[in-house]
Interface confidence: medium
């Protein structure tokens, strides 16, 4: 776990787990079939998902100055996606196999968020949007949209932890 009082997290552990997250996110939503045929419906959107942006202090300078801003943002995102993956969007029909990568992804998101959460310290978490598609195909489409935005999120997080492990580890 991260040490209380805003000290550095276990960068190397975080790096390893975030790399695993990247692999799982891509296996949960790889390209399938004749991708020219893929086109999104506009039934549901995932505009409310967290993004790591310029002002979040996740750039090399920001991480050097105070990594807590960036780590808090990453933590919020991890909790947000962990909640989404545990919601009926993913547990409802169409059913996923019990050992699907989504299940492993869910557990790994929780693992990394716990690694970042300082003991006795609770960062604010973002409210997940109330997305409840009525049709199974809409739910399936929403799953893929969520997974695609998660791929982007964990890719940035993995780069942050790789940088931290290389330059900020004690």
């Amino acid at each position: 776990r991260a040490v209380p009082g805003g000290s550095s997290p276990a960068w190397t552990q975080c790096q390893q787990l975030s790399q695993k997250l990247c692999t799982l996110a891509w296996s949960a939503h790889p390209l399938v079939g004749h991708m020219d045929l893929r086109e999104e419906g506009d039934e549901e959107t995932t505009n409310d998902v967290p993004h790591i942006q310029c002002g979040d202090g996740c750039d090399p300078q920001g991480l050097r100055d105070n990594s807590q801003f960036c780590l808090q943002r990453i933590h919020q995102g991890l909790i947000f996606y962990e909640k989404l993956l545990g919601s009926d969007i993913f547990t409802g029909e169409p059913s996923l196999l019990p050992d699907s990568p989504v299940g492993q992804l869910h557990a790994s998101l929780l693992g990394l968020s716990q690694l970042l959460q300082p003991e006795g310290h609770h960062w604010e978490t973002q409210q997940i949007p109330s997305l409840s598609p009525s049709q199974p195909w809409q739910r399936l489409l929403l799953r893929f949209k969520i997974l695609r935005s998660l791929q982007a999120f964990v890719a940035v997080a993995a780069r942050v932890f790789a940088h931290g492990a290389a330059t900020l580890s004690p």
Epitope: P30, G33, R38, E39, D42, S95, W137, L140
Partner: antibody, heavy 124, light 111 residues
């Protein structure tokens, strides 16, 4: 009620052309992938062609590639299949169907509902 | 292309009794994303096909719960817990992992 209604089938000589139509109602046609599937008399089902909601991308079975063209007019809620250079082996009942599976696999699947079909007979 | 086989090709059934149809693919239909890309369709006599099961095991809207799909990889099964007279017709499996291909069909009729 979600409905698909095919038309345009008939008797045509080998080498001839036909244009099939599929009129959709009861759903927002412009949001859905659509497909054509055919069934030769007394035989099984064969996927023919698919099209994305905008009409901007299409895909064909090898057996019809270069001869058939799938298209759609979202303003008219209608799907089309232009069939040229017809052969005896194209004789079949042609069904259009709404394709829900393209949101999980680019190949499609999960076809629901299907139209009642239109019969195409290629014979001299 | 992936080849699909079904067995039996003909299945005489007794109303009230269970029935089972097997579908095999020449390669696994289980994708790494956790979905089996297999559908089941029923074509009743003189009618167009109708969707029964999608993605291996999910019952389509309006399909009676006596129908169930199971299996993974290359071996799939469609079960009817208690056959009714209206269940007669030809049952097709279809793979959607690669270029779409249907099985040859299983004709179910009353004994």
């Amino acid at each position: 009620e979600v409905q698909l209604l095919e038309s345009g089938g008939g008797l045509v000589q080998p080498g001839g052309s036909l244009r099939l139509s599929c009129a959709a109602s009861g759903f927002t046609f412009s949001r859905y992938h659509m497909v054509w599937v055919r069934q030769a008399p007394g035989k099984g089902l064969e996927w023919v062609s698919s099209i994305v909601p905008s009409g901007g991308s299409t895909h064909y079975a090898d057996s019809v590639k270069g001869r058939f063209t799938i298209s759609r007019d979202n303003s008219k809620n209608t799907l089309y299949l232009q069939m040229n250079s017809l052969r005896a082996e194209d004789t079949a009942m042609y069904y259009c169907a709404r394709d829900l599976g393209s949101y999980s696999s680019g190949w499609g699947g999960w076809f629901d509902p299907w139209g009642q079909g239109t019969l195409v007979t290629v014979s001299s | 292309d992936i080849q699909m086989t079904q067995s039996p090709l003909s299945l005489p059934v007794t109303p009230g009794e269970p029935a089972s149809i097997s579908c095999r693919s020449s390669q696994s239909l289980l994708h790494s994303n956790g979905y089996n890309y297999l559908d089941w369709y029923l074509q009743k006599p003189g009618q167009s096909p109708q969707l029964l099961i999608y993605l291996g095991s999910n019952r389509a809207s309006g399909v009676p719960d006596r129908f169930s799909g199971s299996g993974s990889g290359t071996d799939f099964t469609l079960k009817i817990s208690r056959v009714e007279a209206e269940d007669v017709g030809v049952y097709y499996c279809m793979q959607a992992l690669q270029t779409l291909t249907f099985g040859p069909g299983t004709k179910v009729d009353i004994k």
